[in-house]
Amino acid sequence: EVEKTACPSGKKAREIDESLIFYKKWELEACVDAALLATQMDRVNAIPFTYEQLDVLKHKLDELYPQGYPESVIQHLGYLFLKMSPEDIRKWNVTSLETLKALLEVNKGHEMSPQVATLIDRFVKGRGQLDKDTLDTLTAFYPGYLCSLSPEELSSVPPSSIWAVRPQDLDTCDPRQLDVLYPKARLAFQNMNGSEYFVKIQSFLGGAPTEDLKALSQQNVSMDLATFMKLRTDAVLPLTVAEVQKLLGPHVEGLKAEERHRPVRDWILRQRQDDLDTLGLGLQGGIPNGYLVLDLSMQEALS
């Protein structure tokens, strides 16, 4: 706590300006009026205050606004935002996307901090849903943002917002998240023609069911192996060799390199060996000729 001392003669701050960087902490505390600071917050970011001096400025704002800062102050916090704790941020009511952008800019290039996560949570909860503009903003600053949300949180993303999602935004998503996002993407892109549709839906296919993969195999999409390897195993298993060949097109040759990895390994185990042989890739491990496959609750091969 900074002790209360009288401001030395001639040092009372008439405005927030660069001369304040030469003030000791106690001088800042004594000579800078909190109300003046609040009205001139936009100037703080242009002044190279030390971290210790920023502590004092924050302390002054905390005293002035014990219930939480107004948005007019929050919008101009600049790098003073880095001094805020999640507890501070939970007191805020941030409604403007411009305010959100201004604060995310301060943290740009760094990992998402607990402060930023709290800020985003407060903002999204205040809006009620992740609208397109918000999602656009968040994924621009944090490509992995979408994949940091729980499936429950993702359910509040309207299909229209999916247009803002770039392939790299989904890089760290797990199957549970893609299960939620895929139907939204399918709805969002439903009016596009075949090739354009595939380009857009490709990143979301980790959540696609078998019937959609079968439909895609009829459209000459030439899915690359990287996308195929991210498909749900349970969605790939029922596909026939012919369907996989059509789905992958010229990329089918890549199956050989992935034959020991899921979902390719599990898919091979479900195919007849003579069907696999038609691919001419030397894939081994299929069901030997003359065996009957019964699709029971658990997989069995009976002679």
Partner: antibody
């Protein structure tokens, strides 16, 4: 070598303005503050204010508030000091000086005025 | 406003030690800078941060600062040291000069 070169002597009438220039060379102009100091004939050194050439930020001595304006042109590494509403007691030699701002843990502090201009004599006379 | 006080003049014989004082409230808490100015010339920094000497300044110049007083000491004073000496400190972001001491080498 590091030097500050000031503009030549000026003679002005009371009420007029004078603008003195200070051209830096031999160092990074935006890396140091420029302070302005004046000295009336036979008198003490009197600090007038400073400008940060990097940000354009200024701070003026109370005595000169409203009459002095400090500016800079980074493209030509030059700082300027303009004093308006001149009076006869503004007759003095005006100096610019280079000062480093040192970042301490808690606050910044100025170091010494390690390089000075040669001075510009300003005479105010009717 | 903050003020620094210096004696108007100090006299010293060649080879002797000259001491020039500068006083101000809690001056010991601040860094003090000393400048030498010869007639018709610009000031030259001879001591910075109270005790440090810039390169090129002779070793006979030294400084100290404690309490309310800073002192510039010139040991083995030479005729060429005859000049006006100004102390200076910063009051936050503003510079304050003493009114100078004329050092006469007898």
């Amino acid at each position: 070598q590091v030097q500050l070169v000031q503009s030549g002597a000026e003679v002005k009438k009371p009420g007029a303005s004078v603008k003195v220039s200070c051209k830096a060379s031999g160092y990074t102009f935006t890396g140091y503050y420029i302070h302005w100091v004046r000295q009336a004939p036979g008198q003490c050194l009197e600090w007038m204010g400073w400008i940060n050439p990097n940000s354009g930020g200024t701070n003026y001595a109370q005595k000169f508030q409203g009459r002095v304006t400090m500016t800079r042109d980074t493209s030509i590494s030059t700082a300027y000091m303009e004093l308006s509403r001149l009076r006869s007691d503004d007759t003095a030699v005006y100096y610019c000086a280079r000062v480093e701002a040192v970042a301490g843990r808690e606050y910044y502090y100025f170091s010494g005025m390690d390089v000075w201009g040669q001075g510009t004599t300003v005479t105010v006379s009717s | 406003s903050y003020e620094l006080t210096q004696p108007p003049s100090v006299s010293v014989s060649p080879g002797q030690t000259a001491s020039i004082t500068c006083s101000g409230e809690k001056l010991g808490d601040k860094y003090v800078y000393w400048y030498q100015q010869k007639p018709g010339q610009s000031p030259v920094l001879v001591i910075y941060q109270s005790t440090k000497r810039p390169s090129g300044v002779p070793e006979r110049f030294s400084g100290s600062n404690s309490g309310n007083t800073a002192t510039l000491t010139i040991s083995g004073t030479q005729a060429m040291d005859e000049a006006d000496y100004y102390c200076q400190a910063y009051h936050a972001s503003t510079a304050v000069f003493g009114c100078g001491t004329k050092l006469t080498v007898l």
